[in-house]
Amino acid sequence: SIPWNLERITPPRYRADEYQPPDGGSLVEVYLLDTSIQSDHREIEGRVMVTDFENVPEEDGTRFHRQASKCDSHGTHLAGVVSGRRAGVAKGASMRSLRVLNCQGKGTVSGTLIGLEFIRKSQLVQPVGPLVVLLPLAGGYSRVLNAACQRLARAGVVLVTAAGNFRDDACLYSPASAPEVITVGATNAQDQPVTLGTLGTNFGRCVDLFAPGEDIIGASSDCSTCFVSQSGTSQAAAHVAGIAAMMLSAEPELTLAELRQRLIHFSAKDVINEAWFPEDQRVLTPNLVAALPPSTHGAGWQLFCRTVWSAHSGPTRMATAIARCAPDEELLSCSSFSRSGKRRGERMEAQGGKLVCRAHNAFGGEGVYAIARCCLLPQANCSVHTAPPAEASMGTRVHCHQQGHVLTGCSSHWEVEDLGTHKPPVLRPRGQPNQCVGHREASIHASCCHAPGLECKVKEHGIPAPQEQVTVACEEGWTLTGCSALPGTSHVLGAYAVDNTCVVRSRDVSTTGSTSEEAVTAVAICCRSRHLAQASQELQGSSDYKDDDKHHHHHHHH
Amino acid sequence: QEDEDGDYEELVLALRSEEDGLAEAPEHGTTATFHRCAKDPWRLPGTYVVVLKEETHLSQSERTARRLQAQAARRGYLTKILHVFHGLLPGFLVKMSGDLLELALKLPHVDYIEEDSSVFAQ
C-alpha cells in the first residue's frame, strides 16, 4: 500500500500508485546538508553522490560511541524521502550530500556556511540544471546564515529548510527565518500540526507551507534494505524539496519566486486545524499543505499572488511595520491589521527602487502588521496614486487615471489617532472600478498597474455591524490582488488576504459599542491576465492545467 | 532581513578613535556590530564569523584576517584563521578570545561579526 504521506501529496484526481510523472525530477540536482549517509542503501543506491565535504563539530561526551548506522540515520532517511525508489517523492532526482551534522545530529552555523559556499563554488565550476538545496536543520536566529542563504538564492538556487521542531515562532530560528528560503512546517495524517514529545512543529509568518512530517517511512541505515518511520520538520522539508525537484524538472526555467507561488497555489487549503497554534500566531501561519501539481505542464496562464506578513511593529506610538515582496514579485496591494484596532492604516511607498507596504501603529495600540499582496505579473508597470485627506464630507477618493492602468489595491493612512465612528457616506465605486474611496480624514493610496492583458474588477460584501469577520472571495479564474475595508472606521481591526478570500476583521462585539447602522464592507479587487492565459495556450495548445477547486495563495515572511 | 525582529541579540561595540593607527580606518559614522545567538546553550564562544562589506575582494579578506592576527599577537593573543570565505559572503572564520572583539570590529571592511553557534537536525 502507498504510504500516507505520498498519498497526501498526490493531486486530488490521481491515485498515488498511478501518478507517475515522466521524469520524476531527473533534470534537477538536490543538495542535502545533513549527517553522513548510507548511499549504497537499496532505496537510494546510485542516486546520491557523497561529496568529500565534511565540516562537523566533535561529538559531545566522553562515552559517545560512533556507531555508523546512528551517524547515518537522519541523512539516509531524508535522502530516501526525497528520491527513494519505493518511498521517495522525486524518484528521478539525483542528490549530492554534504556532511554538516555529526553523529549526534549537531552542527555549526560556520560549518553550514562553508557548506553553502562549497555548493556555490561547485555551481560556478560546473553549471548544471536547476539546483535545490535541502537544509533539514535549525539553529537560533543567525544574521550570517540568513545572508548566505539570500546570496545563494539570488544565484538561482532553490533553498528548502525545516521550520524547526521547537513549537515556536519559526522567525526565531535560522535558516527558517530567511525570507528567500522555502520554510516548511510539519503536519500528520490527520492534517494536524505535528507534536514531537512536549514540542512540535514551528509556525508563524516565516513558514511558507506545511508538508507531511509524522510517521514518514523512509530508508533506514540499520541495514541496506531496511525502512524506518521518522518524524519532524526535516521530513516535511524533504517532501517539499522533492516536489520542487519535480516542478523544476517539468519547467527548468522557473525562478524561485515562480516556484514558491506554484508550491503555494497547488497546496491543499484550509485543512490544518489551527487551534493547535497559539492564538496570536493563527492569522500569521499559512494553512497550506504541499502537494504535487496535477500536471507536469506549466501553469503559466494563472495570475499568482501570495500574502506576506511583516514582523510585528511593536507598541510604541510611531512604530511602523514593513512587508516586502521578493525581488521579482510586484506589490499589488497593501493592508494592515492590529489586534487592538488601534492603528493608523497603511501606505505603499518606494524603498530602494521597490514598493513596500508600511503599516502605522496608533497611540495606545499594541502594534500593527503590514500585509503585502505579492504577485507574479510579467512586464508590469505599477505606481501608487495618493489623495490627501478630503475636507468634504464626501470622503477621500483616488483613481487610476493613466491610460491602460487598472486598480489592483487600495490603502488608507491617517494621522489622526482615531477616525471616529462618524462615517462618510459609503459611496460605492460602481461604474468606476479604478477608484478607491475612503474616510475624509485619511489619505488614500491606489495601486495602479499596467500589464499586458491585465483586467481587474471590484467585488464587495457588506454586512451590518457588529460582526467580527466579513469576507468576500474572487471567483474561479480570478485572483485576489487587493483587500480592504469600507469604511476605515475605528472598530475595524484590519483587512488581509487568505488564499483568494479578502477577510475584514472587526472588534469583538462586546467591546465596540457600535451601532447596528454601521456596515462593514469587505472590498476585494480580483484580477486576471488574458495575456498569460493566451501565452500558455499557445505553448500547450490548450489550457489543461486548471485546478479543480479554487486558486490558492498564502503568505511568506520578511 | 530587517533587524526589526529583535530575534537575536545585537551588541554594538563603539569605535574608539585612539585605536593603533589603522591605515584604512572605517568610513566615518559606520559601526560594525556584533551578533550572537539568543539561545545561550547554543552559543559557541571562541569562534567568530567576521563578515566583510559586500564588495570586499578575497585578497582584502585575507589581508584583514592577517591584520587581525598581527594586532592580536601584539596584545599577546593567539588567533587561528579557520576559513576565508569568498563566493557567497566575503569574510573569514576565526578562533580567538572574545576579548579581541572590540579590536576586530574596528578593522577595515568589517560589516558585522557573529559568534558561531550550533545547528541541529530537525
Partner: antibody, heavy 115, light 109 residues
Framework: QVQLVQSGAEVKKPGASVKVSCKAS????????ISWVRQAPGQGLEWMGW????????NYAQKLQGRGTMTTDPSTSTAYMELRSLRSDDTAVYYC????????WGQGTTVTVSS | QSALTQPASVSGSPGQSITISCTGT?????????VSWYQQHPGKAPKLMIY???NRPSGVSNRFSGSKSGNTASLTISGLQAEDEADYYC?????????FGGGTKLTVL
Amino acid sequence: QVQLVQSGAEVKKPGASVKVSCKASGYTLTSYGISWVRQAPGQGLEWMGWVSFYNGNTNYAQKLQGRGTMTTDPSTSTAYMELRSLRSDDTAVYYCARGYGMDVWGQGTTVTVSS
Amino acid sequence: QSALTQPASVSGSPGQSITISCTGTSSDVGGYNSVSWYQQHPGKAPKLMIYEVSNRPSGVSNRFSGSKSGNTASLTISGLQAEDEADYYCNSYTSTSMVFGGGTKLTVL
C-alpha cells in the same frame, strides 16, 4: 569506464573453501555495494547476497545458510565472496555485479567442485 | 525465495514483436517498481536491458521496452533481430533480498 574484474577459475574438492575476488573501478565505490550471483551449468541466475563498500554490511540470501561470507576492502577497491564446505552442487559460474541494481557485471569466475 | 515465473521459451521471426512475461507476487513484482530484465548470450555475463520496470540504460536499443501490471512484468522486443537470440531473465526486489526468474530462451526463427 565502470568495470568489475574477477579472479580466475578455481577447482576445489568437496568440503574445501573458495574465495572469489572482484575489483571495482570507474565509479564512486561507496555509492554501490556488490551483489554476488551464481549460475549452475544449464541453470538460471541465483542471487547470493550483497556486501557494502561503505561499511562492510552484508545481506545474504537465506539459501547460503552461513556457508558464505562476503567482505570488501575499500583500500584496494575489491570485494570478496568466500564459500565454505563446498559441495558438488556449488559448481557454477560466480558473478559479481554492481549494487542491487546489478547494472554492471564482472566477467564471471568458474568454480568447479569435484573429487 | 521462490523464483519468478517466466515461460521457458518463446520464439519469433525477424521483424516480429514478442513479449516475455514474468509473474511474481505482491511481495516482489507487485510490491516494487524495481523489476529489471537481463539478456545473456551463451558463455557471457548477463547484460542489463531494462531497469525499474520500464527504463532503458543508455546504449540499449529502443526496440526493448518493459511494463508492469499487478504482479506481472513484461519485456517486449519489437522488430526482432537475429542477435536478440539469447536467454532473458527478470529480476525483482523482495522485502529484504532479490529474486530472479527462471529464464526464457528466445529463439529467432
